[in-house]
């Protein structure tokens, strides 16, 4: 978790002098509770936005927006703590809005935004906005949270972001798989414009079951420049196992930008349809 471009982050707006500070996610009001604390944020909204760094890279960011409730507690509102927790790693990053002037009611509802938390493809985050000071131990909570799921690199808008392109999102192998005679599969896919090797991972399963009955790995050497964007054809020999008929073919590239961690593409061949042939009725009935 990180902030996009650590340039001057702004939270000031007409009628409010405000500064954005790094936060340890442990505000002083936890340790030294105050008697009077503000109410919770209203209408917390999160959207996926896209922002360019100064270097020109494009990153997905969480756009966080919330409003204040129209009650007298804004007189005691000293700022806000924004927290983003990545759920699969428990990594947390916080920033603090520090109000340098007192808030006053005005003709419009106070609204705040922040769009500098960089998020990763296919990750889920808990986004929390805490009004400061935080409540006393038994006080009503004054925060709002939402769990936010970021689309993966298959998503059309995500595909062109720097982290997705680095993992090979622009490569479309257009995999085709056909079953040949004599227990063979023919796999065909389009090579990318990089001289790097590929791996085909074949996993076979029985019909309607999820434990594999056959696994095979096939190495494809790095293509020459004149082979870039051409189709590569590989014939794989299957184990002659009756019922081991559903095949998943996965292609793993090893691009220089992502090495062992590139996006994989897969295709599946289903088991052949079994014709519903009725049991043959014998011409005669045996008597024994």
């Amino acid at each position: 978790l990180r902030l996009l471009d650590h340039r001057a982050l702004v939270c000031s707006q007409p009628g409010l002098n405000c500064t954005v500070k790094n936060s340890t996610c442990l505000d002083d009001s936890w340790i030294h509770p105050r008697n009077l604390t503000p109410s919770s944020p209203k209408d917390l909204q999160i959207q996926l936005h896209f922002a360019h760094t100064q270097q020109g890279d494009l990153f997905p960011v969480a756009h966080i927006e919330w409003t204040l409730q129209t009650d007298a507690s804004i007189l005691y509102l000293e700022g806000a703590e924004l927290s983003v927790l990545q759920l699969n790693t428990n990594e947390r990053l916080c920033v603090r809005f520090e109000f340098l002037s007192k808030l006053r009611h005005h003709h419009r509802r106070w609204r705040f935004t922040f769009s500098h938390f960089v998020v990763d493809p296919d990750q889920e985050y808990e986004v929390t906005v805490h009004h400061l000071p935080k409540p006393i131990p038994d006080g009503d909570p004054n925060h709002q949270s939402k769990n936010f799921l970021v689309p993966d690199c298959e998503h059309a808008r995500m595909k062109v972001t720097t982290p997705c392109m680095s993992s090979g999102s622009l490569w479309d192998p257009n995999i085709t798989v056909e079953t040949l005679e004599a227990h063979q599969l023919r796999v065909s896919f389009t090579l990318w414009n990089e001289s790097t090797h590929y791996q085909i991972l074949l996993t076979s399963f029985p019909h309607m079951e999820n434990h594999s009955c056959f696994e095979h790995m096939h190495h494809i050497p790095a293509p020459r420049p004149e082979e870039f964007h051409q189709r590569s054809n590989v014939t794989l020999t299957l184990r002659n196992l009756k019922g081991c008929c559903r095949h998943q073919v996965q292609i793993q590239p090893f691009f220089s930008s992502c090495l062992n961690d590139c996006l994989r593409h897969s295709a599946t061949v289903s088991c052949p349809e079994m014709p519903d042939t009725p049991e043959p009725i014998p011409d005669y009935m045996p008597l024994w």
């Epitope: 799921l149 689309p151 993966d152 298959e154 998503h155 059309a156 808008r157």
Partner: nanobody, 126 residues
Framework: EVQLVESGGGLVQPGRSLRLSCAAS????????LHWVRQAPGKGLEWVSG????????DYADTVKGRFTISRDNAKNSLYLQMNSLRAEDTALYYC???KGLGYCRGGSCSYFDYRVQGTLVTVSS
């Protein structure tokens, strides 16, 4: 202009099933998370179920969990809600709703919903 048109509602007996459909147009359907929300007579809007852009994630309100199933067909720009074991308390106007922004939030909207004040009426009564 975002268009969301629901269909499939009707009068049904308790314990029976219905399948709601929502035809969408006016936006890139496959980019957005979608939801079903409902409004019972004299009540406020209640979130029912949500589905992420690629159907990789589905969530349900506790009141419908195990009975309702949300699905989508990005090729047909359509959203569905399969409702089984219907109860009298499921009687409501059902709306399909599009997330205003990209991304998906568990248990409701991340930002505001786009939906049309049309809906399809489901009445569960014996």
């Amino acid at each position: 202009e975002v268009q969301l048109v629901e269909s499939g509602g009707g009068l049904v007996q308790p314990g029976r099933s219905l399948r709601l459909s929502c035809a969408a147009s006016g936006f890139t359907f496959a980019d957005y998370a979608l939801h079903w929300v409902r409004q019972a007579p004299g009540k406020g809007l209640e979130w029912v179920s949500g589905i992420s852009w690629n159907a990789g994630r589905k969530d349900y309100a506790d009141t419908v969990k195990g009975r309702f199933t949300i699905s989508r067909d990005n090729a047909k720009n359509s959203l569905y809600l399969q409702m089984n074991s219907l109860r009298a308390e499921d009687t409501a106007l059902y709306y399909c709703a599009k997330e205003k922004g990209l991304g998906y939030c568990r248990g409701g909207s991340c930002s505001y919903f786009d939906y049309r004040v049309q809906g399809t009426l489901v009445t569960v009564s014996s």
